[in-house]
């Protein structure tokens, strides 16, 4: 399977909400010996590969924010801890998989990375990842909304395998 | 804050078996990988097997297998290690570590480490 | 298996000495590539992730570089709380395996 970023870039105002997506393309395995774990965390764009790095969103790092269930399953975080940060990451049957973050602040600017990792029973695992910009603004040259701007064809596919 | 708290230390005869146990807090339990590391005394890390509680299933070092079983409890969020014919090359402390993400990523928290001693 | 050698076994230095610990794989391992530092009687802590980035609540005297096969962990200006054992650990490929440590001494 591979992720993709529908969005390479979100242009937001300050105070807006913003939901960054990724999707998983291609053969999903569904059996009782497969798993998903499916994450978010920032990143820096690495000279060696991007999303090497994960920093902590909001103060809550890739493992508060991970969903993990079967292959067909929708899953949320747990809602209090997220929500107490302004975050809610989601996962539903159709492979898109979300954070959205409520009340933008110039702080939240940076690069997001979501992680999806296939994990078998034998020991053996498939990841991939996402990288998209957000990019929050304040003051006259603000949009009044979230502008989204699509990855181009080679970038939608953002593809990291171990 | 995640911690990983082990059972004490052991005396053993060789020959015999031994479990450790690896009791976890304070984060999702059944989702991680954890791992059983030893180190033989002045020696280094050596991986010994691991183990995802929801599949219960687990993975051992080749070096390993046949002779060590690792099993996890999601109800009490507890993974054990069992060793069984003890020989005196045994002797080693035993850590149960956490993988942050899947089966080979980093270790980001160890169990403070139980000795166990084969001795006759 | 992927086998890890880090070089030197052990070195001297003082404090504020910048140290540098090799670690070389036996086979491409991208950037997945862990760094722990060992104080005796102690269990190992984590340093250094993905080859290079630094763990949450780790001085940002370490710092890790590297990809491929080979990898340095640097500590720009050593404290007196650095002495201690540092290993390497590959996390590209089940089994997981370790360099087999150097020892920071103080001369």
């Known amino acids: 399977f591979k992720v993709a970023t529908p969005y390479s870039l979100y242009v937001c105002p300050e105070g807006q909400n913003v939901t960054l997506t990724c999707r998983l393309l291609g053969p999903v395995d569904k059996g009782h010996d497969v798993t998903f774990y499916k994450t978010w965390y920032r990143s820096s764009r690495g000279e060696v590969q991007t999303c090497s790095e994960r920093r902590p969103i909001r103060n809550l790092t890739f493992q508060d924010l991970h969903l993990h269930h079967g292959g067909h399953q929708a899953a949320n975080t747990s809602h209090d801890l997220a929500q107490r940060h302004g975050l809610e990451s989601a996962s539903d049957h159709h492979g898109n998989f979300s954070i959205t973050m409520r009340n933008l602040t110039l702080l939240d600017s940076g690069l997001y990375c979501c992680l999806v990792v296939e994990i078998r029973h034998h020991h053996s695992e498939h990841r991939v990842h996402g990288a998209m910009e957000l990019q929050v603004q304040t003051g006259k040259d603000a949009p009044s909304n979230c502008v989204v701007y699509p990855s181009s064809s080679q970038d939608s596919e953002n593809i990291t395998a171990a | 804050q995640v911690q990983l708290v082990q059972s004490g230390a052991e005396v053993k005869k060789p020959g015999s078996s031994v479990k450790v146990s690896c009791k976890a807090s304070?984060?999702?339990?059944?989702?991680?990988?954890i791992s059983w590391v030893r180190q033989a005394p002045g020696q280094g890390l050596e991986w010994m097997g691991g183990?995802?509680?929801?599949?219960?299933?687990?993975n051992y070092a080749q070096k390993f297998q046949g002779r060590v079983t690792i099993t996890a409890d999601e109800s009490t969020s507890t993974a054990y290690m069992e060793l069984s014919s003890l020989r005196s090359e045994d002797t080693a402390v035993y850590y149960c570590?956490?993988?942050?993400?899947?089966?080979?990523?980093?270790?980001?928290?160890w169990g403070q480490g139980t000795l166990v001693t084969v001795s006759s | 298996d992927i086998q890890m050698t880090q070089s030197p076994s052990s070195l001297s230095a003082s404090v504020g000495d910048r140290v540098t610990i090799t670690c070389r794989a036996s086979?491409?391992?991208?950037?997945?590539l862990n760094w722990y530092q060992q104080k005796p009687g102690k269990a190992p802590k984590l340093l250094i992730y993905?080859?290079?980035s630094l763990q949450s609540g780790v001085p940002s005297r370490f710092s890790g570089s590297g990809s491929g096969t080979d990898f340095t962990l640097t500590i720009s200006s050593l404290q007196p709380e650095d002495f201690a054992t540092y290993y390497c650990?590959?996390?590209?490929?089940?089994?997981?395996?370790f360099g087999q440590g150097t020892k920071v001494e103080i001369k």
């Open positions: 570590a956490r993988h942050s993400i899947g089966w080979v990523a980093e270790l980001d928290y």
């Open positions: 304070g984060g999702t339990f059944s989702s991680y990988a």
């Open positions: 183990i995802i509680p929801i599949f219960g299933t687990a």
């Open positions: 086979q491409s391992i991208n950037t997945d």
């Open positions: 650990q590959q996390g590209a490929s089940d089994p997981i395996t």
């Open positions: 993905a080859a290079s």
